[in-house]
Amino acid sequence: AAMGSCSKEYRMLLGQLQKQTDLMQDTSRLLDPYIRIQGLDIPKLREHCRESPGAFPSEETLRGLGRRGFLQTLNATLGRVLHRLADLEQHLPKAQDLERSGLNIEDLEKLQMARPNVLGLRNNVYCMAQLLDNSDMTEPTKAGRGTPQPPTPTPTSDVFQRKLEGCSFLRGYHRFMHSVGRVFSKWGESPNRSRR
């Protein structure tokens, strides 16, 4: 759902959330293009691209939250993700530079689709929270109570270090989306029943 329009149909909304998280855990949509564009597509460099511990909540943590707590955590985490993705985008090569160096422009387009897709997921998270009558969550088109602050990477002038940090973040993001998808897959057929 775009621009704050919400479906009142639980199963439809849950289906959309599951579909979105399925797409977002797919590394070919974000991490792989990033690795290619940033010239990290070398076995020796790839092995440095590991998820930073604590950057995202674990699946175990998410499972222990209950539906409302889970949606609130997901909303807050997606807010941070939007910032980190925008930050990564700022430091990507420009389209004309990619063409000159013979890299695939489609990879850049995939990366630039990530933020609107996260926005779409976040809107559906908000809608699901409304459906479960969770009044604590901010409407997606209004300012929130402040984005919870992430464990921010230490500022560095080292371009290579920045690329690796981006890579680690994206790896963690895909893993987190996989965990989110698994949590949603355990949700019951109705807003009131939970399969644990």
Partner: antibody, heavy 121, light 111 residues
Framework: EVQLVESGGGLVQPGGSLRLSCAAS????????MSWVRQAPGKGLEWVAT????????YYLDNVRGRFTISRDNAKNSLYLQMNSLRAEDTAVYYC??????????????WGRGTLVTVSS | DIVMTQSPDSLAVSLGERATINCRAS??????????MHWYQQKPGQPPKVLIY???NLESGVPDRFSGSGSGTDFTLTISSLQAEDVVVYYC?????????FGGGTNVEIK
């Protein structure tokens, strides 16, 4: 009343520095990302920089990155723009603006009246 | 960077008549069902004021003679019946990616 008031503008020589401030009132400052937008005399509008609500993330126009630094002090309800290595083309009215809407896809709903920065020898 | 081309630069319209301003982006500013395009009005010696956000949403307090439409690369601001106070400059703004960029502006005048 929601209000943004800029200060710190003035005449500076090329290569010089200036620090602009923006005092916010009438809203919960720490809940909003904030931006600086400028307008050269008789010209159009140009986005300069944005800072996230908590200050962890900053975004810049390419030709000011490395010269300008946006920062904020939520305890003081204040936004800042530190401008170094100023050039003649930085001459403009600098507006402080509040960001609303979808995170990182904001638009500006409240603006200050602006402060004029003139870079000239 | 996305270049926003506004047209016309200047527009002369009779009071009570319809005024239409266009804005074309050098690449799509729409994605995932969202249109990241906004419209502003600026009176002489004043800061800009938002009229329309996300292509078609009327900002609170803005008269309903203003409307916005469009998606992808082409967007339109329409003033259904021009009033004397509308004779000022209008700008489009995209927020699809950083840097956000404004159109060059359209000066609306009375015919």
């Amino acid at each position: 009343e929601v209000q943004l008031v800029e200060s710190g503008g003035g005449l500076v020589q090329p290569g010089g520095s200036l620090r602009l401030s923006c005092a916010a009132s009438g809203f919960t400052f720490s809940n909003y990302a904030m931006s600086w937008v400028r307008q050269a005399p008789g010209k159009g509008l140009e986005w300069v920089a944005t800072i996230s609500d908590g200050g962890s993330f900053t975004y810049y126009l390419d030709n000011v990155r490395g010269r300008f630094t946006i920062s904020r002090d939520n305890a003081k309800n204040s936004l800042y723009l530190q401008m170094n290595s100023l050039r003649a083309e930085d001459t403009a009215v600098y507006y402080c603006a509040r960001d609303v809407g979808h995170t990182t896809f904001w638009y500006f709903d409240v603006w200050g009246r602006g402060t004029l920065v003139t870079v000239s020898s | 960077d996305i270049v926003m081309t506004q047209s016309p630069d200047s527009l002369a319209v009779s009071l009570g008549e319809r005024a239409t301003i266009n804005c074309r982006a050098s690449k799509s500013v729409s994605a995932a069902g969202y249109n990241f395009m906004h419209w502003y009005q600026q009176k002489p010696g004043q800061p800009p004021k938002v009229l329309i956000y996300y292509a078609s949403n009327l900002e609170s307090g803005v008269p309903d003679r203003f409307s916005g439409s469009g998606s992808g690369t082409d967007f339109t601001l329409t003033i259904s019946s021009l009033q004397a106070e509308d004779v000022v400059v209008y700008y489009c703004l995209h927020s699809r990616e950083f840097p956000f960029t404004f159109g060059g502006g359209t000066n609306v005048e009375i015919k």
